[in-house]
Interface confidence: medium
């Protein structure tokens, strides 16, 4: 019968010929009367056999990631008679793995959106690297993830690649972050190979800023001939939030005379001071009113950012008109 052990050849061997093992018949008494032959894909080109001894050699550098096993056939012939000594047999040469592939992130580019002010531990995104090396061969394809850039705001779970928030972020200070994640094989041991990826994390806005008046004092004038409904001027607040979180409503907080009103222009987000009652220079030639501004939409959980509405004082001077 045939005698052999399992055949393994390490990939990426640089030697011109690498001894893999020996195929022999137990009838072979070593007097060189038998001839061994190798058949199948790779025979003669990748692998050769010593016809006399049955020793098998790899004569080419192999890449396990290209091909991990070869199925070959062996024959043994009695040189004297030309007849087969053993029935033809199939055998396998396995290419054993070395750590010659770095982890690669295949789903790049990564981009995620997370609300600003999200609490620590909030999941942002999961990144996954793959390693072409053999996962069953030691730690060649066992990956560990780490953060190269993104502290202190983000962290990555070493074994899963899950990125989480580790510190609250304020969109109004910075609205996007580039996080760099490294995946290292060999679970980080010496000889490890690594790959990196970038993740763009954008912060979406939450209503964590109240509108604030640009000026603490506005001065306007109104002619005593102005009819009711006249727009006598505009006031403006600014809000560091964006979109609907920056939509605001102006109102009168204090006007003892009940002479003025404020309406909101929702397109420009300005407050328009309107004359509600006609004024008379001889009766009163200046007025002081206090206006306030609030956001239009404030979710309950964000009310803590909106406790005291911003106010402004408006000095309104009445202009005299010569009366007939």
């Amino acid at each position: 019968g045939w005698v052999w052990n399992q055949f393994f050849v390490p990939e990426e061997m640089n030697t011109t010929s690498h001894h893999i093992g020996q195929l022999r018949s137990d009838l072979d008494n070593g007097n060189n009367s038998f001839q061994y032959k190798l058949l199948g894909a790779g025979a003669g080109s990748t692998f050769i056999i010593d016809e006399r001894t049955g020793d098998i050699y790899a004569i080419q550098k192999l890449d396990r990631e290209e091909r991990s096993l070869y199925i070959l056939r062996a024959q043994v012939i009695d040189i004297a008679t030309g007849r087969a000594v053993e029935p033809e047999s199939e055998f396998v040469i396995k290419v054993s793995d070395i750590n010659d592939n770095e982890p690669k992130f295949l789903d790049e580019p990564y981009e995620a959106i997370v609300p600003e002010m999200s609490p620590e531990g909030t999941l942002v995104i999961q990144v996954t690297a793959s390693d072409a090396d053999d996962p069953s061969s030691g730690n060649n394809a066992r990956l560990l993830y780490s953060l190269l850039q993104g502290q202190p705001y983000f962290s990555v779970e070493p074994t899963t690649g899950v990125i989480r928030i580790s510190s609250k972020m304020d969109r109004e200070l910075q609205d996007e972050y580039w996080v760099i994640i490294q995946a290292k094989d060999m679970i980080g041991q010496p000889g490890a190979l690594s790959g990196t990826t970038s993740v763009l994390i954008k912060l979406s806005d939450v209503n964590d800023n109240k509108p604030i008046f640009k000026e603490s004092l506005y001065r306007l004038t109104v002619s005593e001939s102005a009819p009711t409904g006249t727009s006598i001027g505009t006031i403006m607040a600014y809000d560091n939030d964006i979109g609907e979180n920056a939509e605001m409503d102006y109102s009168i907080e204090e006007d003892d005379s009940q002479t003025f009103d404020i309406i909101t222009n929702h397109e420009t987000q300005e407050g328009i001071v309107i004359l509600k009652k006609k004024v008379d220079f001889e009766h009163q030639n200046h007025y002081g009113i206090r206006a306030k501004v609030k956001n239009h939409h404030v979710p309950e959980q964000l009310m803590k950012y909106h406790t005291e509405a911003s106010t402004t004082f408006i000095k309104i001077q009445v202009e005299d008109v010569d009366e007939p």
Epitope: R219, S257, E282, H283, Q284, H286, G288, K315
Partner: antibody, heavy 119, light 107 residues
């Protein structure tokens, strides 16, 4: 420190002119409306004129309208009162005063400068 | 214009006594637009009260203001030696007018 210092007062004949100055320091002069208020000897206070912070609007008491002109130079932190066609009844201590941001009352006054109109 | 009339013209009191000064307007004044000032001889006026009842910065709490419409009052709860001076009310709703003053003198 925060202060207003008037100058330019003196004795002038009726019909004459005088220019008063008020130098402001220690606060953001260009943010405040400024006024002149006068006080005749032994009498009460009388408001004279106001100028808005940036100089765009000026208002005067009926008794001085057309004769007095209020102005300011924000780059020099100085308020002025140009007084023409002076009358005996204009004799008074003239104070410059700062209006508060939230009303028309005066939270800061100068020490005053005396203007005497006499023949 | 709105005329402010102060009474009495002179108030003679001793230190520690309570002083009540009155200011009456010829027409209604919004309480938001009435102030009180103190003036000592040879000095500029000093703001005490604005908005009829709000104390200005640094003014002791023995000074208080009240009133609305046409009648306003300045009260000094217990006179200190430095409180003897002339007191003026001022309305600033329609132009700027001052009362003629009340002199608080030592009895």
């Amino acid at each position: 420190q925060v202060q207003l210092v008037e100058s330019g007062g003196g004795v002038v004949q009726p019909g004459g002119s005088l220019r008063l100055s008020c130098a402001a320091s220690g606060f953001s002069f260009s943010s405040y409306d400024m006024d002149w208020v006068r006080q005749a000897p032994g009498k009460g206070l009388e408001w004279v004129a106001v100028i808005w912070y940036e100089g765009s609007n000026k208002y005067y008491a009926e008794s001085v309208r057309g004769r007095f002109t209020i102005s300011r130079d924000n780059s020099k932190n100085t308020l002025f009162l140009q007084m023409n066609s002076l009358r005996v009844e204009d004799t008074a201590v003239y104070y410059c005063a700062r209006e508060t941001g939230e009303g028309w009352y005066f939270d800061l006054w100068g020490q005053g400068t005396l203007v005497t109109v006499s023949s | 214009e709105i005329v402010l009339t102060q009474s009495p013209g002179t108030l003679s009191l001793s230190p520690g006594e309570r002083a009540t000064l009155s200011c009456r307007a010829s027409q209604s004044v919004s309480s938001s637009y009435l102030a009180w000032y103190q003036q000592k001889p040879g000095q500029a006026p000093r703001l005490l009260i604005y908005g009829a009842s709000s104390r200005a910065t640094g003014i002791p709490d023995r000074f208080s203001g009240s009133g609305s419409g046409t009648d306003f009052t300045l009260t000094i709860s217990s006179l200190e030696p430095e409180d003897f001076a002339v007191y003026y009310c001022q309305q600033y709703g329609s132009s700027w007018t001052f009362g003629q003053g009340t002199k608080v003198e030592i009895k």
